[in-house]
Amino acid sequence: IWELKKDVYVVELDWYPDAPGEMVVLTCDTPEEDGITWTLDQSSEVLGSGKTLTIQVKEFGDAGQYTCHKGGEVLSHSLLLLHKKEDGIWSTDILKDQKEPKNKTFLRCEAKNYSGRFTCWWLTTISTDLTFSVKSSRGSSDPQGVTCGAATLSAERVRGDNKEYEYSVECQEDSACPAAEESLPIEVMVDAVHKLKYENYTSSFFIRDIIKPDPPKNLQLKPLKNSRQVEVSWEYPDTWSTPHSYFSLTFCVQVQGKSKREKKDRVFTDKTSATVICRKNASISVRAQDRYYSSSWSEWASVPCS
């Protein structure tokens, strides 16, 4: 048993048929010694008396808010949550496996630049009685600070018969050095509590591996005289790291016809302009990627040829 926060405790249970459970001793936080009784949740049934209560925790029915009283007055509370371990592996019932980039990916994180700011998100089908708390650090043995905000519900989607809820959190490395080579990964830890079930999820990554630039901005077309060609120009996104001479992007320019089946013409360039043939009803799209480290491409920025 360990303390998650004040008056909230997590009991780690091996979860299998006829498991013996864990013996837990609760102590009433009071100087009083006599006349103390214990109850669980809203029930008025007295579970025991005395300053300590010893219980055998085997299942969710044994978890909940234990309260000690004296003479009708509440003295203190202890909330017991369960963390299930099945065959040596902690349960992952609360969050949905996103399966990208590999199986058992529960947390996904992205950064728009090298400033040390990043966003993580996760999915669940649970809509109520759900709380998250997020901690992060750089390295685990001698951790350096990363500050995370509160997790918030950022999207709701319908997936077949189910609703899916996306939560996200923003974190910022306290003393980030954008130009430095990373040797220790960022560690992100999410505590999830659904009713009386506790789970924790972790992700470990280097900022360089989760970079996804914003799309190029100010995408413009300039027709070339007496030609079907146009000059496409764009600018680095405002959110990208500076100076651009050091934090350079490479770009992919794509001409796509109205029909998805039509052949796409693609050009790769390190410049912020390119000359392409603009077909009728086609559109021109540009996306960006870190020039020196192949992390994710940005989403496309698009303009119609007409």
């Epitope: 065959d87 040596g88 592996i89 590999k102 972790t202 470990s204």
Partner: antibody, heavy 125, light 104 residues
């Protein structure tokens, strides 16, 4: 699939300490739990210690509990096993083993899908 | 602990089954061709086979017993096979004592 390379073995004196290092390459090391397994001469395999993917969760076999410390550096893709107060019965070949997933503490050895070549430790006066 | 037979034998081309029983919910199988040589995983998590292991190796689990089956046994399969599991009583890894497969 990736490789695991152990180092740090050799002749050790009783009562002394040793530090074994497992260096991983060729896979996303920080995504997996890792275990140390040993084999004494003429005996079977014995789970020694394990560590979860982030390094916060650890476990130890009864023969080394209280004398062993397992740690990992995900930046360097290494796992270290420190064993103190060495005994003759610690003489064995020590293998580093990778589990196929995370979420445990390196004790779910039914998930081991890759092994190192081993490093031999001899404890003798 | 985990219980497995100390030895089994098979004819070349035949089929052999090695069992492992205990309280673990999942099992793995590890082949060691000689003492001191590194074990090789032939099956992990009951029935998963690493990509470099021949398809003649398969694993299954029924109740609390796991079975390693080798169909079309070959001379090079002669080895000691260890099963591995998880000991719930004290949160630790656990190996069987090993089964020696002799190819006749």
């Amino acid at each position: 699939a990736g490789t695991l390379d152990e180092s740090g073995g050799g002749l050790q004196t009783p009562g002394g300490a040793l530090s074994l290092v497992c260096k991983a390459s060729g896979f996303s090391f920080r995504s997996y739990d890792v275990a140390w397994v040993r084999q004494a001469p003429g005996k079977g395999l014995e789970w020694v210690a394990g560590i979860g993917s982030t390094g916060r969760c650890t476990g130890y076999g009864s023969a080394v509990r209280g004398r062993a410390t397992i740690s990992r550096d995900n930046g360097q893709s290494t796992v270290r096993l420190q064993l103190n107060n060495l005994r003759a019965e610690d003489t064995a070949t020590y293998y580093c083993a990778k589990e196929s997933g995370s979420g445990g503490c390196g004790w779910a050895i039914y998930r081991i899908d890759a092994w190192g070549h081993g490093t031999e430790v001899i404890v003798a006066a | 602990g985990l219980t497995q037979p100390s030895s089994v034998s098979a004819n070349p081309g035949g089929t052999v089954e090695i069992t492992c029983s205990g309280s673990s919910g999942s099992y793995g199988w590890y082949q060691q061709k000689s003492p001191g040589s590194a074990p090789v995983t032939v099956i992990y998590q009951n029935d998963k086979r690493p990509s470099d292991i021949p398809s003649r190796f398969s694993g299954s689990k029924s109740g609390s017993t796991a079975t390693l089956t080798i169909t079309g046994v070959r001379a090079e399969d002669e080895a000691v096979y260890y099963c591995g599991g998880y000991d719930r009583s004290n949160s630790s890894g656990l190996f069987g004592a090993g089964t020696t497969l002799t190819v006749l």
